[in-house]
């Protein structure tokens, strides 16, 4: 056969979907790989061909599009599983082509299993909500395209393994799912169970998310620098170990980057000579508000470290910080009966 | 196409147990419920519980927690629930049926008859 | 348990009559309530969910309505073939229950 832009297998698009429920894959071709879209490729005359490789074999074959009720279907550049099952589980290869032009792309496709409360080896989507920001909302994921606008589904929803009914502060819209005042206790796993007819048959499809409860961007504030502060002074001799550590709270902030670093003599430590090691660890509080500690470190520290200006800075969508460590050189104690005999004219 | 098949009627002695068994073909027999429901004539439709076969998780109907055992065999996609001492107040139609987490019947088996005699 | 009063227990229809059945929650079950209908010597099949969802092939003489504890159930012109026992049952919570039934005779 004559050559074609194999763009590989890609995993990026790892697909999960649920066993038993309707799946519907568009082809990644148009989405990620080439600039223009299935209907041109269509005017075009161009043809998309599906085809796959089963779970542990290596062998390609054609899709069955005869299966009983069609249960496997292609409309667009829309494969249909109308319902999947366990061993539909494998990598799919959508390829465009004419008799001058060819362009294939692969992409793995995993049924799942869930059991009675909805867990699943499904990757789940995370949705953030502010601790008490007022009404938030999630709504079910991925059922576009389903069914048409006419169709009304009905919509359960469940947190964990439990009907949402008669909640404090969740309410269930249809799909969507209103929380009046989030708190840490509505942390957890939402499930949404879609139900529409189609063509004479019931259908059902399950989506589950992780909601996690965030800090409030009312209660966000600009970096705070524990360590150092003015309270603790580094005093070190020559040769001793120098250890200084920087400690950060930052507010949970949406898609904010948080930042810690050191400078030595208002120089990053990788722009001096000196030889200085730099740790970092990181922690969370129950809402995602985070403490980033740097420890500075210079194994054998010299007269001239001792002299040098060392400061944390902090940065975040709310601000930059800085602070001084306040290092000094230990002046020795004084050898007590060497001097006394000086002063009294001892030789 | 789904099918709940029911085994046969069953005549047993007062005291003694039963298993009646529900084999599902049509769709994935791990990812629904299935429910077990008691007819007796005049007496309605009376909801016993279910199991999940998927992880073996049950819900009864406290009424019958002593009275059923639901079970459930992947391998053969196959329902069973074990009602024991029985007493003439056991003699009734039970059917098997499935359900979507939505705690509704779409699918039911044809039911099995059991008489209990003393 | 929520008990579900339905109502009537027998009702004399014609052919082509409208029929309302009612079923009263002892307490609220939001819109949960399911109908089924049973014939002599067969199993109960699903006729509605969610008080007023028509499950796939139900003809769209059957119809309901309500939510809270107050439910109705109507057929609009009443066929010969469906003359059986009609059953609500709440799939709001555990334990599930199910109303007495009505069953349609010939008047």
């Known amino acids: 056969s004559e050559r074609c832009d194999d763009w590989g297998l890609d995993t990026m698009r790892q697909i999960q979907v649920f066993e038993d429920e309707p799946a519907r894959i568009k082809c990644p071709l148009f989405e990620h790989f080439l600039k223009f879209n299935y209907s041109t490729a269509h005017s075009a005359g161009l043809t998309l061909i599906w085809y796959w490789t089963r779970q542990d074999r290596d062998l390609e074959e054609p899709i069955n599009f005869r299966l009983p009720e069609n249960r496997i279907s292609k409309e667009k550049d829309v494969l249909w599983f109308r319902p999947t099952l366990l061993n539909d589980t494998g990598n799919y290869t959508c390829m465009l082509r004419n008799t001058t032009y060819c362009s294939k792309v692969a992409f793995p496709l995993e049924v799942v299993q869930k059991d009675s409360c909805f867990n699943s080896p499904m990757k789940l989507p995370v949705h953030k909500l502010y601790i008490e920001y007022g009404i938030q909302r999630i709504t079910c994921p991925n059922v576009d395209g389903y069914f048409p606008s006419s169709v009304k589904p009905t919509i359960t929803w469940y947190m964990g393994c439990y009907k949402i009914q008669n909640f404090n502060n969740v309410i269930p819209e249809g799909m969507n799912l209103s929380f009046l005042i989030a708190l840490i206790s509505n942390n957890g796993n939402y499930t949404c169970v879609v139900t529409y007819p189609e063509n004479g048959r019931t259908f059902h499809l399950t989506r589950t998310l992780t909601v996690k409860v965030v800090g409030s961007p009312k209660n966000a504030v600009p970096p705070v620098i524990h360590s150092p502060n003015d309270h603790v002074v580094y005093e070190k001799e020559p040769g001793e170990e120098l250890l200084i550590p920087c400690t950060v709270y930052f507010s949970f902030l949406m898609d904010s980057r948080n930042e810690v670093w050191w400078t030595i003599d208002g120089k990053k430590p990788d722009d001096i000579t000196i030889d200085v090691t730099i740790n970092e660890s990181i922690s969370h509080s129950r809402t995602e508000d985070e403490t980033r500690t740097q420890i500075l470190s210079i194994k054998k520290v010299t007269s001239e470290d001792l002299k040098r200006s060392y400061v944390c800075h902090a940065r975040s969508a709310k601000g930059e910080v800085a602070k001084a460590a306040k290092v000094k050189q230990k002046v020795p104690a004084p050898r007590y009966t060497v001097e006394l005999a000086c002063g009294f004219g001892a030789t | 196409q789904v099918q709940l098949q029911q085994s046969g009627p069953e005549l047993v002695k007062s005291g003694a147990s039963v298993r009646i068994s529900c084999k599902a073909s049509g769709y994935a027999f791990s990812g629904s419920w299935m429910n077990w429901v008691k007819q007796r004539p005049g007496k309605g439709l009376e909801w016993i519980g279910r199991i999940y076969p998927g992880d073996g998780n049950t819900n009864y109907n406290g009424k019958f927690k002593d009275k059923a055992t639901l079970t459930a065999d992947k391998s053969s996609s196959t329902a069973f629930m074990q009602l024991s001492s029985l007493t003439s107040e056991d003699s009734a139609v039970y059917f098997c049926?499935?359900?979507?987490?939505?705690?509704?019947?779409?699918?039911w088996g044809q039911g099995t008859t059991l008489t209990v005699s003393s | 348990n929520i008990v579900m009063t339905q109502t009537p227990k027998f009702l004399p229809v014609a052919a082509e009559d409208r029929v309302i059945i009612t079923c009263k929650a002892s307490?609220?079950?939001?819109?949960?309530v399911a109908w089924y209908q049973q014939k002599p010597g067969q199993s109960p099949k699903l006729l509605m969910y969610y008080a007023s969802n028509r499950y796939t092939g139900v003809p769209d003489r059957f119809t309901g309505s309500g939510s809270g504890t107050d439910f109705t159930f109507t057929i609009s012109s009443v066929q010969v073939e469906d003359l059986a026992v009609y059953f609500c049952q709440q799939h709001y919570s555990s334990p599930l229950t199910f109303g007495a039934g009505t069953k349609l005779e010939l008047k």
């Open positions: 307490q609220d079950v939001s819109n949960e």
């Open positions: 049926a499935r359900d979507y987490y939505l705690f509704y019947f779409d699918y």
